[in-house]
């Protein structure tokens, strides 16, 4: 019975036309949402001025529906046993499941200043820089819609430069109407333990983001995994948004819509400095704001994003080194609502439920020659917002689960 | 790889003249804006002059109506001529680029962003 059943599996989590798994793989049967809560600057004065601590107050849900979409461009290649595609990008605002409307404003760090003063070191282009800040009545913080913020908003200051340069800033813009990848996976049709893993992104196997192994593109894009999963497993997966691979460790058994799944987590230690977790050292890419690889819990993927200095952490700064969070006023990180973790069907590999957590930090840093940078006195990892993605199998989805694969096994 | 080659330097009496050079290779991209530095002994950098691709000129007050900075674009260069000079205009001078604001610069410079000559000594003697 068991071998029939292991044959049955092998055969329908085969990433190819007809089976369970490629009907589920090229447009999810899931509802995934994405929530976002954004840090409100309560002070933005007394930070410019005085070099205070930044005062937030968080806001939120805004909820978006998203992974909508079904994989584009998908193409077999027998050859090698693979199946390349593309990931479109879209979302659609749920009013009914957010606090308020896109039409909201905050007061946030402006994104062009902080950026544009760290990428261009030069005193006189920082000159530069300055005269067409205060021109177009810039300053560090701003106030933005929530629509601007995510989707996108002209900047006034980059207005301004008489250069080709995109004036167009937002933290996910271009998003709707782009695709991630190309990403090309093993289709599981020869070896069914490579189902689902990444051979390339974006045609290579590597980010060139990175140093040594921290660059590899490792494991599946976590929506499932080869069948058969053990406890005792690390369970490696990419991530575009966090720009690396990442693992994930077994913590519990949990009983979801009744499927026994098997609930793995980020633990802290893939987060860690290179002091207690020597892996990470290829993680640290500079010594002044890690202070000499010894922070922890925010990564830098600036290379990433053209030069921008864009950290990425746990919510709240959960697994974070006192030092980062220490400029920060209004923050409460706790685990059960800011770590990651996915809930994987052992049989199948797939994930049926899952929450993805993760905050997005601009790094701001004193500047003598830019005017409203001149009164700080120390480098901050602002915090600007965090996202909570979450998708759970549908309860018709999991009734034929439960019939058709657990049901069999018990 | 941008690289920056100034010359012109030397010994001259006060009141006297001297054009300082500096070519730079490289992607002219991340040497759009070019200035001159100078540092007397025991004393810090600072910015004498600078000319952006565009035409923006800065001078430094102890500077201005003596000395005047130009560029040619053609030969990625940039000039310094220094008149009535005085014994405080004492000091290694060291041309400095870098890119303005351009969508490219991160994709042709890398995330180097500030580019220095190797300096040449001007002594102005009373």
């Known amino acids: 019975g068991d071998l029939l059943i292991q044959k049955t599996i092998k055969k329908q989590v085969v990433l190819e036309e007809g089976t369970i798994a490629f009907k589920n793989w090229v447009k999810t049967g899931t509802e995934v949402y994405r929530q976002f809560w954004i840090f409100d600057v309560q002070n933005p004065q007394e930070v410019m001025m005085n070099s205070s601590n930044i005062q937030v107050k968080q806001r939120g849900p805004y909820t978006y529906r998203v992974r909508f979409l079904a994989k584009e461009n998908v193409t077999q290649d027998a050859e090698d046993n693979t199946v390349s595609f593309l990931q479109p990008n879209g979302a659609i605002f749920e009013p009914s499941l957010s606090v308020g409307t896109e039409a909201d404003n905050f007061t946030v760090l402006n994104l062009a200043v902080a950026a544009a003063s760290h990428i261009y070191q030069n005193q006189f282009v920082q000159m530069i820089l300055n005269s067409l800040i205060n021109k177009s009545k810039s300053s560090m913080f701003q106030v933005r819609t929530l629509r601007e913020l995510l989707w996108g908003y002209r900047d006034p200051f980059l207005s301004l430069v008489p250069y080709p340069v995109t004036t167009t800033v937002g933290l996910f813009y271009p998003y709707n109407n782009t695709a991630d990848g190309v990403y090309k996976v093993f289709n599981g049709k020869d070896n069914i333990s490579k189902v689902a893993i990444i051979d390339t992104y974006k045609g290579k196997r590597n980010l060139s983001y990175w140093e040594s192994h921290c660059d590899m593109i490792n494991g599946t894009d976590a929506a499932s995994f080869p069948p058969f999963v053990e406890k005792s497993q690390v369970l490696q997966f990419f991530s575009s948004d966090i720009c690396r691979s990442i693992y994930a460790v077994f913590e519990s058994d949990v009983n979801l819509k009744g499927i026994p799944v098997y609930r793995f987590v980020l633990p802290s230690k893939a987060f860690a400095s290179p002091v207690e977790n020597p892996d990470n050292y290829c993680f640290c890419t500079e010594k002044i704001i890690s202070k000499n690889c010894t922070s922890y819990g925010v990564l830098d993927i600036s290379k990433c994003k053209e030069g921008r200095p864009v950290y990425i952490s746990l919510p709240h700064f959960l697994y974070a080194s006192p030092d980062v969070s220490e400029p920060i006023d209004g923050l409460n990180p706790n685990e059960e609502e800011h770590r990651t973790y996915l809930d994987i069907e052992p049989i199948t590999g797939f994930t049926l439920q899952f929450a993805k957590r993760l905050q997005v930090n601009l790094l701001v840093k004193p500047s003598e020659k830019i005017q409203v940078l001149k009164n700080l006195k120390r480098n901050y990892i602002v915090p600007i917002l965090w996202l909570n993605e979450t998708g759970t199998i549908g309860d018709e989805k999991a009734n034929m689960f439960r019939s058709q694969v657990t049901g069999k096994i018990n | 790889q941008v690289q920056l080659q100034e010359s012109g330097g030397g010994l001259v009496q006060a009141g006297g003249s001297l054009r300082l050079s500096c070519a730079a290779s490289g992607d002219t991209i991340c040497t759009s804006a070019m200035a001159w530095y100078r540092q007397a002994p025991g004393k810090e950098r600072e910015l004498v002059a600078g000319?952006?691709?565009?035409?923006?000129?800065y001078y430094a007050d102890s500077v201005k109506g003596r000395f005047t900075i130009s560029r040619d674009n053609a030969k990625n260069t940039v000039y310094l001529q220094m008149n009535t000079l005085k014994p405080e205009d004492t000091a290694v001078y060291y041309c400095?680029?870098?890119?303005?604001?351009?969508?490219?610069?991160?994709?042709?410079?890398?995330?180097?962003?500030?580019?220095w000559g190797q300096g040449t000594q001007v002594t102005v003697s009373s």
């Open positions: 000319i952006s691709s565009g035409g923006t000129v």
């Open positions: 400095n680029a870098g890119p303005e604001v351009h969508d490219d610069v991160f994709r042709l410079c890398g995330p180097t962003t500030d580019y």
